[in-house]
């Protein structure tokens, strides 16, 4: 199972639920569904309040039980380390895969943290991060922002991923904007 890590804004916008949490306990495999279940302790929720309704405390995250079908394997054994988890809700349960955005909170830049907590949501409705995988590539719409990080280096390590968000400049037009300048 291979997938290109998304721009964090894309991960935020395409996810039903975005939380900060610690992985605690030993993973378990459900012997009916064959899904692996990680116990988590949620510390913050950034997206999903409406989707969750009253069940605002997520205690488990679910993933396929095998790597080849995109199961997520949590490698850290540090139970006090916080992770940003962006996943999908299925039957009220948080699901993630290898392709989901799961990253140690401490590994995120200050700009990315600002994005997840406040800014990415502003670009979700109107703007699209458009991956540029090979040259030449051109904008297909004024609401697209060309994401070129993959051309230069690992997509999640690039400047646009770590410091920029695709946000509305005016109706029908989105541009890359610095998250740094927005950090209070």
């Amino acid at each position: 199972c291979t997938c290109v890590p998304p721009h964090p804004q894309t991960a935020f916008c395409n996810s039903d639920l975005v939380i900060r949490a610690k992985f605690v306990g030993t993973p378990e495999v459900n012997q009916t569904t064959l899904y692996q279940r990680y116990e988590i302790k949620m510390t913050k929720m950034y997206k999903g309040f409406q989707a969750l309704g009253d069940a605002a405390d997520i205690r488990f995250v679910y993933t396929p039980a095998m790597e080849s079908v995109c199961g997520y394997f949590h490698r850290s054994h540090n139970r006090s380390e916080e992770f940003l988890i962006a996943g999908k809700l299925q039957d009220g349960l948080l699901h993630i895969t290898t392709c989901s955005f799961v990253a140690p909170w401490n590994s995120l830049s200050l700009a990315q943290r600002r994005g997840f907590t406040k800014t990415y949501t502003v670009g979700c409705e109107e703007c699209t991060v458009f991956p540029c995988l090979s040259i030449p590539c051109k904008l297909q719409s004024g609401t697209h922002c060309l994401w070129t990080d993959q051309l230069l280096q690992g997509s999640e390590k690039g400047f646009q991923s770590r410091h920029l968000a695709c946000l509305p400049r005016e109706p029908g037009l989105c541009t890359w904007q610095s998250l740094r300048s927005q950090i209070a």
Epitope: V29, T33, A65
Partner: antibody, heavy 113, light 111 residues
């Protein structure tokens, strides 16, 4: 009591196909993931494939991926293994297992020309 | 392609205790509490003796016990009896290969 009975084994030529069945009784079939495990003559056990209770998730060993297909019919309490492009190294006793607690007695598949 | 390492053979006299080891990695034995042990007599299907590292199914003698330390699981049989002579296989959940087995250990009861 829990019972698993395999059938469908036999002699088949290399490149041929075979479909194994496993009739289950004595438990709520749809509540359990099921697996196929095989054992070549004089050798150890090798996991082949698994399927979730609903049939929505299927997993395969690398050695059979793309050639074997696991499926189930919960209305008939039956598990299946469709085996295509069979090779000599697929020769084994094939066991059906209720996610590794109860096992059937096995059915022998021989791939030979 | 044996994933878990077991001794090829062990032996003991009636009444003695023996232990069979099963060594894996942190992605199988060490990472999960899903280790099972099976007993297989010649020409028979495997029979579950221990599941989830140390649990015994009903009907299995309490002479059989399981444990785990790090990446190694162990099956101990106390008060060895003639009918214990069989092949024993360990099995673990593994994230990459889903289910993996040991190569099997032939237990011989002497005398």
């Amino acid at each position: 009591q829990v019972q698993l009975v395999e059938s469908g084994g036999g002699l088949v030529q290399p490149g041929g196909s075979l479909r194994l069945s496993c009739a289950a009784s004595g438990f709520t079939f749809s509540s359990y993931a099921m697996s196929w495990v095989r054992q070549a003559p004089g050798k150890g056990l090798e996991w082949v494939s698994a399927i979730s209770g609903s049939g929505g998730s299927t997993y395969y060993a690398d050695s059979v991926k793309g050639r074997f297909t696991i499926s189930r019919d919960n209305s008939k309490n039956t598990l299946y293994l469709q085996m295509n492009s069979l090779r000599a190294e697929d020769t084994a006793v094939y066991y059906c297992a209720r996610f590794f607690d109860y096992w059937g007695q096995g059915t022998l598949v021989t791939v030979s020309s | 392609d044996i994933a878990l390492t077991q001794p090829a053979s062990v032996s003991g006299s009636p009444g003695q205790s023996i232990t069979i080891s099963c060594t894996g990695t942190s992605s199988d034995v060490g990472g999960y509490n899903y280790v099972s042990w099976y007993q297989q007599h010649p020409g028979k299907a495997p029979k579950l003796m221990i599941y989830d590292v140390s649990n015994r199914p009903s009907g299995v003698s309490n002479r059989f016990s399981g444990s785990k330390s790090g990446n190694t699981a162990s099956l101990t049989i106390s008060g060895l009896q003639a009918e214990d002579e069989a092949d024993y296989y360990c099995q673990s959940y593994d994230f990459v290969r889903f289910m993996v087995f040991g190569g099997g250990t032939k237990l011989t009861v002497l005398g």
